[in-house]
């Protein structure tokens, strides 16, 4: 079954390569187990950047190798992606799955365009 997912259209990463955005889903029922996946759509590719499963009220547990962290509050997930560089600029899509209890619901956001600007190197000091 389909579910609405909202996320910001544009986010600018910090000078340290960190981007944060909120992914909000309109839960049709009382889900106790939720899976959130961040997809990057760019360069003619789709990449699962990170994924987390959490029980409502608990902290997010991300899969291996994750460059993401996050927290949940109700039907909102606050996601942070770290270690970004200019070449990582792209459309980051939030995918939410309500895993339990049935029925299964799937929602995919329209994506957040994350812009990353590499900082200028500091000039040498004499």
């Amino acid at each position: 079954k389909a579910m609405h997912v909202a996320q910001p259209a544009v986010v600018l990463a910090s000078s340290r390569g960190i981007a944060s955005f909120v992914c909000e889903y309109a839960s049709p029922g009382k889900a106790t187990e939720v899976r959130v996946t961040v997809l990057r759509q760019a360069d003619s590719q789709v990449t699962e950047v990170c994924a987390a499963t959490y029980m409502m009220g608990n902290e997010l547990t991300f899969l291996d190798d994750s460059i993401c962290t996050g927290t949940s509050s109700g039907n909102q997930v606050n996601l942070t992606i770290q270690g970004l560089r200019a070449m990582d600029t792209g459309l980051y899509i939030c995918k939410v799955e309500l895993m339990y209890p049935p029925p299964y619901y799937l929602g995919i956001g329209n994506g957040t365009q994350i812009y990353v600007i590499d900082p200028e190197p500091c000039p040498d000091s004499d």
Epitope: T47, V49, C50, A51, D64, I81, L84
Partner: nanobody, 125 residues
Amino acid sequence: EVQLVESGGGVVQTGGSLRLSCAASGRTFSMYTMGWFRQAPGKDREFVAAISRSGGLKAYADSVLGRFTISRDNANEMAYLQMNSLNPEDTAVYYCAAAPVPWGTRPSHFTYDSWGQGTQVTVSS
């Protein structure tokens, strides 16, 4: 480096399926991000798919999304590429590759320092 050997290539009709396998040896397989690339005659090598070290995260080229599935079996040091709904544009030599790096946003650009010898896939119309 890890040694990689591909198998499973062959000739198949349009719309058919193949499953490519990549056997690894020599190093701890679970420390490597694994990728599949392909090279058609007269063209550059291109990214097909990649999978994270635990197998939980994946990436696909738009051209194969929904048709190809990458997977891995760390216990047996194997990587796989299930290819369905094949068409003549999929004809190429397919290479398995390993990158000793964690996951990120652009696995197609990882430094893959180990490559297999390739296996030929031919899709006839």
